[in-house]
């Protein structure tokens, strides 16, 4: 549906005018400006950038731009007492030490305040002991170690390779296995693409490069000291012992040069299979401990980082809606970086900046969106999505009543192969229709639509002729809006070819080598992929804020609900005897999904036919669409995860980055064959089916005729 019926319309004030105003050269210029020095959360440099963005957004023409500050728990290395790992001999002498910092990229030798690699929120400690190699430290890796190989990690220091799952899940798994320390490293198998040179000669990770990152298990809590409430001036803070999600054992990241020195001496058990071998010239023995000649040597960690309550600053810009100012469409992305943030986050922040500029240009010409658009530059995302979560906690009552949609805008690129979209099913049709109107930037697709290149390169596994759209997980600032508040959310970026590039993320993720030059030389010299992402993100915001009828299709939710019900039923049916014994039935869930499908279909018919010139009926229908996502929220939350309240989607309990469907049922079924009390375990499965069925039915009824 076109947005040409927006307020104050002249022919030029439409989506096309907005999109035509977006310029690749501006995105390039903004990226350069945002990446010349580090912008670590809680630092003066990042505060100054917040004020710069505030000033520029005002110049661009937003109605108001305010800083929203919070005092949250952050974590920093000790400047005078660096973190490192040693190999020690039987006399306790350090015979090898890991690097204290990454060799800086050429041209950046004299930049100050580059934070050395560290695992944010690691406790202090100097554990020493034998090493156990635990592959990716996934749930299944520990199952293999403990159950199949009978290797006990209790009292050991484990070394795990980065990749596959969120690092916080690795640390949680290691803690549960009884480890007393965790070493995280980047294996070339995951962070070095064959045939590409190391930075600065290519986009691969050098041996001295290290991935920073937080190791929290917050489960959506935000600031660890103020879960559920904003970390404002009068906040009551928990003691550190009661803080949410902090790891209990020391953790430290290293590069593959240093990992080689630790892994080359490993003895004990051989790797169980080839999936446990990376690309280093080491045996990938599991341990515990070093091989014969080195068996008296141990590994010692030296971790001295501190947790500190520190002020952070969000920038919140408002473009007031002309017709429905009390309906909010939000575009948000973070500003804080680990070091230079060449990709994460500034490739996203530069795109947001250009989107704000384009909207501001239209506004200066007399145009306003139908609904209010809020723009956000979040702080402290890297420390656990803290800025976005605190702001949402502070404004939760407004957001749950007025929030139409949230579009996330972190890194615009993680590759340059094709588009990647994760969103609520409500946005599928919006994304399809928008990408059909945009030009593909891809080589070989000149004159073709983005939809066409995207569908060709990333086809849907279920529906032929359609592109893949993934479930929302977490690990980014949409989390609080979607998983806690039930606001329809989406994200888009350009990605790599997952078929040919098996490495995790992009090789230089969260390293000092994530620079402007990385993007400008290797990923997107013409900034055409950035421009395309700006068009997708900006176009989604434009339509959501401007279309008369909200561009949500509830029928797409019906389709996925059936798919997810089928999937969880199949998982449960791996235990047919127990299902029979404990009278486990999915009938209620399938019945609710059927009802949802029928009601959604009827709602969609009414949506075509109603009188759009009647503002009351229009508002009523739009509210039913807006509140549909909200209807999937269970106020009690998921078991042991009170801030994950969406019944249809949650971050996987085994990988924060991944989305899981019907997570309550999924978790109740997970590893159920190992539960000591099967009756209780299957009782919980039944309870979760009940919660899911009720929620789907209740959501369906919000789409019924109101009276």
């Amino acid at each position: 549906k076109s947005s040409n019926e927006a307020t104050n319309i002249t022919p030029k004030h439409n989506m096309k005018a907005f999109l035509d105003e977006l310029k690749a050269e501006n995105i390039k210029k903004f990226l350069y400006n945002f990446t010349q020095i580090p912008h670590l959360a809680g630092t003066e440099q990042n505060f100054q950038l917040a004020k710069q963005i505030q000033s520029q957004w005002k110049e661009f023409g937003l109605d108001s731009v305010e800083l929203a500050h919070y005092d949250v728990l952050l974590s920093y290395p000790n400047k005078t007492h660096p973190n490192y790992i040693s190999i020690i001999n039987e006399d306790g002498n350090e015979i090898f030490n890991t690097s204290l910092f990454e060799p800086p990229p050429p041209g950046y030798e004299n930049v100050s305040d580059i934070v050395p690699p560290f695992s944010a929120f690691s406790p202090q400690g100097m554990p020493e002991g034998d090493l156990v190699y635990v592959n990716y430290a996934r749930t299944e890796d520990f199952f293999k170690l403990e159950r199949d190989m009978k290797i006990n990690c209790s009292g050991k220091i484990v070394i795990a390779r980065y990749g596959k799952v969120f690092r916080g899940n690795k640390v949680k798994n290691a803690q549960l296995a009884g480890a007393k320390g965790v070493i995280l490293y980047s294996d070339p198998a995951d962070y070095f693409a064959p045939g590409v040179k190391s930075y600065p000669d290519g986009w691969n990770l050098p041996g001295g490069g290290v991935q920073r990152g937080n190791i929290l298990n917050l489960n959506g809590a935000g600031d660890p000291l103020t879960p559920g409430y904003p970390a404002n001036e009068y906040a009551y803070r928990r003691g550190i012992a009661e803080a949410v999600g902090l790891p209990s054992i020391p953790v430290h990241p290293i590069g593959y040069y240093d990992a080689q020195k630790l892994l080359e001496k490993m003895g004990g058990s051989a790797p169980p299979d080839s999936s446990w071998r990376g690309s280093l010239k080491v045996p990938y023995n599991v341990g515990p401990g070093f091989t014969g000649n080195f068996s008296t040597q141990k590994v010692k960690m030296h971790i001295h980082s501190t947790n500190e309550v520190t002020r952070i600053y969000n920038v919140i810009g408002t473009l007031r809606g002309a017709v429905e100012p009390d309906r909010y469409v939000i575009l948000g992305g973070h500003r804080d970086s680990w070091v230079f943030g060449g990709i994460d986050p500034q490739s996203g922040a530069a795109v947001v900046h250009e989107i704000v500029r384009s909207f501001g240009t239209l506004k200066k010409e007399g145009w306003r969106p139908r609904r209010t658009i809020l723009f956000a530059s979040w702080d402290a995302e890297e420390f656990g999505l803290l800025g976005s979560t605190e702001w949402a906690e502070e404004n939760s009552r407004l957001l749950q009543e007025r929030g139409v949609a949230y579009i996330n805008a972190d890194s615009s690129i993680e590759g340059n192969y094709t588009l990647r979209v994760d969103c609520t099913p409500l946005m599928y049709s919006l994304v399809h229709n928008l990408t059909k109107e945009l030009k593909s930037p891809d080589e070989g697709f000149e004159g073709k639509s983005l939809y066409e290149s995207w569908t060709k390169k990333s086809p849907s596994p279920e529906f032929s002729g359609m592109p893949r759209i993934s479930k929302l997980g977490s690990g980014n600032d949409f989390e609080v809006f979607f998983q806690r508040l039930g606001i329809a959310s989406g994200r888009a970026r350009y990605t790599k070819n997952w078929e040919t590039n098996k490495f995790s993320g992009y090789p230089l993720y969260h390293s000092v080598y994530e620079t402007y030059e990385l993007v400008e030389k290797f990923y997107d010299p013409m900034f055409k992929y950035h421009l395309t992402v700006a068009q997708v993100r900006g176009g989604m915001v434009f339509e959501l804020a401007n279309s008369i009828v909200l561009p949500f299709d509830c029928r797409d939710y019906a389709v996925v609900l059936r798919k997810y019900a089928d999937k969880i039923y199949s998982i449960s049916m791996k235990h047919p005897q127990e299902m029979k014994t404990y009278s486990v039935s999915f009938d209620s869930l399938f019945s609710a999904v059927k009802n949802f499908t029928e009601i959604a279909s009827k709602f969609s018919e009414r949506l075509q036919d109603f009188d759009k010139s009647n503002p009351i009926v229009l508002r009523m229908m739009n509210d039913q669409l807006m509140f549909l996502e909200r209807a999937f929220i269970d106020p009690l939350g998921l078991p042991d995860r009170p801030f994950y309240r969406h019944v249809i989607y949650a971050p996987s309990s085994h990988n924060k980055y991944a989305g899981e469907s019907f997570p309550g049922i999924y978790d109740a079924l997970f590893d159920i064959e190992s539960k000591v009390d099967p009756s209780k375990a299957w009782g919980e499965v039944k309870r979760q089916i009940y919660v899911a069925a009720f929620t789907v039915q209740a959501a369906a009824e919000t789409l019924s005729e109101v009276a």
């Epitope: 690097s99 004299n110 000669d201 050098p206 001295g208 040069y257």
Partner: nanobody, 124 residues
Framework: EVQLVESGGGLVQAGGSLRISCTAS????????KGWFRQAPGKERHLVAA????????YYSDSVKGRFTISRDNVKNTVNLQMNSLKPEDTAVYFC?????????????????WGQGTQVTVSS
């Protein structure tokens, strides 16, 4: 693959001076810790001098302290060793090495890239 190429070795009289240089083939090692090892006939290879990524910090073995000076140019991707007051016991093959770590001191296998070596002979 990164290559380190030494140059400037040769024959010099005791008390004389010599400057040896090393150029790296790839920019990826331009800010690595750089070092010079030497190996005399029948002896182990050992580190005589090393320099941090920006030249702020240097290491010298006791045997060369005050006589040798290590320097670097990251733009040209070179590392130099200026050797003064040379002694016959300085006779050795000198190897340039690069290490992607903050640490200067280390053994031969703590370093990640090495040159082929250049012969320095000090005659009495």
């Amino acid at each position: 693959e990164v290559q380190l190429v030494e140059s400037g070795g040769g024959l010099v009289q005791a008390g004389g001076s010599l400057r040896i240089s090393c150029t790296a083939s790839e920019r990826s090692v331009s800010t690595y810790t750089k070092g010079w090892f030497r190996q005399a006939p029948g002896k182990e290879r050992h580190l005589v001098a090393a320099i941090s990524y920006n030249g702020d910090t240097t290491y010298y073995s006791d045997s060369v302290k005050g006589r040798f000076t290590i320097s670097r140019d990251n733009v040209k991707n070179t590392v130099n060793l200026q050797m003064n007051s040379l002694k016959p016991e300085d006779t050795a093959v000198y190897f340039c090495a690069a290490r992607g770590s903050s640490w200067l001191y280390g053994t031969w296998d703590d370093y990640h890239y090495w040159g082929q070596g250049t012969q320095v002979t000090v005659s009495s």
